[in-house]
C-alpha cells in the first residue's frame, strides 16, 4: 500500500478479536517527525504540547480467513509531553529546574484524545464479506497523571492500535455473509 503522508507511517495487520494486535507488526520507515509547534503568538499561560505527535497509521485487518482490501487509517499517539509555560524571557535552564523538580509527583503523557467508530468490511476467500465496527483514534493530547495514579493503574488510555472486539448481532440474517459489531 502506497502512502506518501508527511507524518510517520505504520503499517501492520491486526486481527479483529478481543486480544491485543499481533506482535509481529512491521514498521514503515519514518518520513517525518510528525507535528511541529511554534511558540509564536502564544500568550504567557499557553502550554505547548512539545513532543506529542500524531503519527499516521495504516493497518490491514484480518480475522483469519478474511482480510480488508484497504488498510484502516488512524493516528497513533507517540512521544513525550513536556508542557512549557511560555514566558516573554523564557530561559531553558529555568524551565528545566521547575520541570524536573515536579517530575516525581506528576507526569504528562501523549494519549488518545478523540476517537470515532468506523465500519470495516473483510473480503473472504469464498467470496463472502464480513463486517466489523472498529474504534479509531483521530486526535492526540497531552494528559497529566500523578505518580500515584500511574502506579495504581497502568491503563492510562489505550496507546495501542485499535483493538476490535467481536460479538454477535442480535438479529440474524439469511445470508452467507456475516456481520459483527465491535466496541
Amino acid at each position: 500500500f502506497k502512502n506518501d503522508a508527511t507524518e510517520i507511517l505504520y503499517s501492520h495487520v491486526v486481527k479483529p478479536v478481543p486480544a491485543h494486535p499481533s506482535s509481529n507488526s512491521t514498521l514503515n520507515q519514518a518520513r517525518n517527525g510528525g507535528r511541529h509547534f511554534s511558540n509564536t503568538g502564544l500568550d504567557r499561560n499557553t502550554r505547548v504540547q512539545v513532543g506529542c505527535r500524531e503519527l499516521r497509521s495504516t493497518k490491514y485487518i484480518s480475522d483469519g480467513q478474511c482480510t480488508s482490501i484497504s488498510p484502516l487509517k488512524e493516528l497513533v499517539c507517540a512521544g513525550e509531553c513536556l508542557p512549557l509555560p511560555v514566558l516573554p524571557n523564557w530561559i531553558g535552564g529555568g524551565y528545566g529546574t521547575k520541570y524536573w523538580s515536579r517530575r516525581s509527583s506528576q507526569e504528562w503523557r501523549c494519549v488518545n484524545d478523540k476517537t470515532r467508530t468506523q465500519r470495516i468490511q473483510l473480503q473472504c476467500q469464498d467470496g463472502s464479506t464480513r463486517t466489523y465496527k472498529i474504534t479509531v483514534v483521530t486526535a492526540c493530547k497531552c494528559k497529566r497523571y500523578t505518580r500515584q495514579h500511574n502506579e495504581s493503574s497502568h491503563n492510562f488510555e489505550s496507546m495501542s492500535p485499535a483493538k476490535p472486539v467481536q460479538h454477535h448481532r442480535e438479529r440474524k440474517r439469511a445470508s452467507k455473509s456475516s456481520k459483527h459489531s465491535m466496541s
Epitope: K2, R56, S68, S70, R119, Q121, T131, T138, S177
Partner: antibody, heavy 119, light 110 residues
Framework: QVQLQESGPGLVKPSETLSLTCTVS????????VHWVRQPPGKGLEWIGV???????DYNSALKSRVTISRDTSKNQFSLKLSSVTAADTAVYYC?????????????WGQGTMVTVSS | QVMLTQPHSVSESPGKTVTISCKLN????????IHWYQQREGRSPTTVIY?????PDGVPDRFSGSIDSSSNSASLTISGLKTEDEADYFC?????????FGGGTKLTVL
C-alpha cells in the same frame, strides 16, 4: 464487464411512491455494496441509502422515514422505494457500486434515470 | 456533523494548472479516505481519484490527489488543462459508514 442499469417510471405524482429498480451485471450483490444517489437539477449529489454486501441497509437520516432499499440476488437486482414524494424529490437517480470499507469509493455508476414529481 | 466543503467554482486557461480543495470540518483528514469524481454536463459521475491519491485505469496522470493535514483538506490538481476537463468535480468520503459528498466545484476552462 460491470454494469448497472436503472429502470422505472419517469413521472410520479405527489404523495405517491417512487419505485426504481437497478439491474446489475459483472459482479455479485453479496460481494459489493450498492448505493442509491440522486441529483436534483443543477445541484450536487445526495446520498439516499446503501444495501451492504451482507444484506443490511442504511439510509440518509433526512430521508430515512420514507426510504426502503431491498434486493433480489437471484435476479441481480436491487430496488429503491421512496414514499410520499414531493416536487423536491425531482432528480436524476443513480444506482452505484461501492467498494468495501474502509475506502469504498464509487467505482461504477448507472447512467441515471430522471424522475419528475408532478401532478 | 462531518462535512466536506468545496469552492463553488474555479476557472483557468488551457494548459495551466488548477487545484480544487475539499475541506473537512472535523477530525483529522489523515484518518479519512477521500475520493474525487468528475461529472461532465449531462453525464454520470466517474472516478478520477480514489483513496486520496490513486488514479483508476484510463485517467491521465494530469490528475493528481493529495491530503494536507495542516489545512485539514484534500486537493485535486489538474495540470495541462484541456477543454474536456470542464466539468463538475465532487469529493467524497464516509462519516463512519455513511457516505458524504462535497457540494461540488464547477471547473470552467476559459
Amino acid at each position: 464487464q460491470v454494469q448497472l442499469q436503472e429502470s422505472g417510471p419517469g413521472l410520479v405524482k405527489p404523495s405517491e411512491t417512487l419505485s426504481l429498480t437497478c439491474t446489475v451485471s459483472g459482479f455479485s450483490l453479496t460481494s459489493y455494496n450498492v448505493h442509491w444517489v440522486r441529483q436534483p437539477p443543477g445541484k450536487g449529489l445526495e446520498w439516499i441509502g446503501v444495501l451492504w454486501s451482507d444484506g443490511d441497509t442504511d439510509y440518509n437520516s433526512a430521508l430515512k422515514s420514507r426510504v426502503t432499499i431491498s434486493r433480489d440476488t437471484s435476479k441481480n437486482q436491487f430496488s429503491l422505494k421512496l414514499s410520499s414524494v414531493t416536487a423536491a424529490d425531482t432528480a436524476v437517480y443513480y444506482c452505484v457500486r461501492g467498494g468495501l470499507l474502509p475506502g469504498g469509493y464509487f467505482d461504477y455508476w448507472g447512467q441515471g434515470t430522471m424522475v419528475t414529481v408532478s401532478s | 456533523q462531518v462535512m466536506l466543503t468545496q469552492p463553488h467554482s474555479v476557472s483557468e486557461s488551457p494548459g495551466k494548472t488548477v487545484t480544487i480543495s475539499c475541506k473537512l470540518n472535523s477530525d483529522n483528514i489523515g484518518t479519512y479516505y477521500i475520493h474525487w469524481y468528475q461529472q461532465r454536463e449531462g453525464r454520470s459521475p466517474t472516478t478520477v481519484i480514489y483513496g486520496d491519491d490513486k488514479r483508476p485505469d484510463g485517467v491521465p496522470d494530469r490528475f493528481s490527489g493529495s491530503i494536507d493535514s495542516s489545512s485539514n483538506s484534500a486537493s485535486l490538481t489538474i495540470s495541462g488543462l484541456k477543454t474536456e476537463d470542464e466539468a463538475d468535480y465532487f469529493c467524497h468520503s464516509y462519516d463512519d459508514h455513511i457516505p458524504i459528498f462535497g457540494g461540488g466545484t464547477k471547473l470552467t476552462v476559459l
